[in-house]
């Protein structure tokens, strides 16, 4: 991407990603330099009759680096520290073309859970305090709670009152989502409130 705005590329932790490189049409490329956070990553000299010379200059990422036939950069077994700014400089006889990228590493969401801190009032109304979580959540994970297609909360937590005398069976669903995955987990208000009711009657005996 040669505009001022870098191309944003998402990578998934542990998987592979390709930063696509576009060549100047019809021009012979002298060499290509790939940079990561302004530090040299690799230096490539293409040859018309034999394999290109590839000099990997960053040993940290070296074993995980590969290049396609068009010299796009492939990075495998992605780590969080691969996040950052990448640039490719293509030098021809007449010009130098710059492509910029921002690589963002995201986690596949895993292990969604709901914890319940609910209480039963003397009028038998059940107040549900539910908290949703996923493993290793970061700022780019969005949580919401839904019931019957309506959003009840835009946070990991949900506080809601449920009265079994006037409410029908109700499921509450937590949805956790980021740019590469989403998970959901549903809980039954009736079941949660019955559990609270059992605890409540046990403590009264």
């Amino acid at each position: 991407q040669s505009s001022l705005t870098p191309l944003m590329v998402n990578g998934i932790l542990g998987e592979s990603v390709t930063l696509p490189l576009e060549f100047p049409a019809g021009e012979k490329v002298n060499f290509i330099t790939w940079l990561f956070n302004e530090t040299s990553l690799a230096f490539i000299v293409p040859h018309e009759t034999k394999s290109p010379e590839i000099h990997v200059t960053n040993p940290k990422q070296g074993k995980r680096l590969n290049f396609t036939q068009s010299y796009s950069l492939q990075l495998s077994n992605l780590k969080m520290e691969d996040t950052g700014s990448y640039r490719a400089q293509i030098s021809t006889k007449t010009s130098a073309k710059l492509s910029s990228y921002t690589l963002r590493i995201l986690r596949q969401l895993r292990n969604i859970q709901v914890t319940n801190h609910s209480q039963l009032f003397q009028n038998m109304t059940c107040e549900l305090h539910l908290t949703c979580s996923v493993e290793d959540a970061d700022d780019n994970v969005s949580f919401r709670w839904e019931a019957l297609g309506n959003t009840l909360s835009s946070q990991p937590n949900l506080t809601v009152s449920w009265d079994p005398r006037i409410s029908s069976e109700q499921d509450y669903t937590c949805i956790a989502e980021n740019a590469v995955s989403n998970l959901s987990f549903s809980v039954s208000a009736q079941k949660l409130c019955e559990d609270v009711k059992i605890q409540y009657t046990d403590t009264k005996m």
Partner: antibody, heavy 118, light 108 residues
Framework: QVQLVQSGSELKKPGASVKVSCKAS????????MNWVRQAPGQGLEWMGW????????TYADDFKGRFVFSLDTSVSTAYLQISSLKAEDTAVYYC???????????WGQGTLVTVSS | EIVLTQSPDFQSVTPKEKVTITCSAS???????LHWYQQKPDQSPKLLIY???KLASGVPSRFSGSGSGTDFTLTINSLEAEDAATYYC?????????FGGGTKLEIK
Amino acid sequence: QVQLVQSGSELKKPGASVKVSCKASGYTFTNFGMNWVRQAPGQGLEWMGWINTYSGEATYADDFKGRFVFSLDTSVSTAYLQISSLKAEDTAVYYCARRGGTAEFDYWGQGTLVTVSS
Amino acid sequence: EIVLTQSPDFQSVTPKEKVTITCSASSSISSNFLHWYQQKPDQSPKLLIYRTSKLASGVPSRFSGSGSGTDFTLTINSLEAEDAATYYCQQGIYMPLTFGGGTKLEIK
């Protein structure tokens, strides 16, 4: 119905502080996050950050780390924005906006104009 | 951060005309997390369309939204005088949340 009512306009001198309030009604306050958005005169909308109204945890955009603080008083369903060491370039309308389920801003306050001038 | 580029910046249109505003993102965005707002002069912004194509409460059916990936569109089918406003797109999936630069619609 959902309503967000903000405090009135403020005229402040450079270096002073200001605290803008946003009182919510018509929904369970602790179920929906609260965003703050800045609009400088004649300019577009700029997201400042948001606060989780249940945990009190605040997230700030990079340009708003340091002099800007979000806080809550859940007992009165109110979110606050405090700006310290005010500068002329802080002159803007500040909006609170409720965070919807997919991080849309589904309800907005009427805005509070903060003018910083010596 | 994700850059949202709106086009055009400004448009002068006549009533009953069809208007299309585009929002181009610097990275692919899940359609659930792309939203549109309308802001009239001296008023707060108002949610117009959320999750790419869902009309917010009370929004007339002449407004519609579409798109996926990096390219999204707001369409006003038969423009009315009251639609004179600035329109903003916004993404909600990556921190920091970002807005487009706005498209000002003037009614001739």
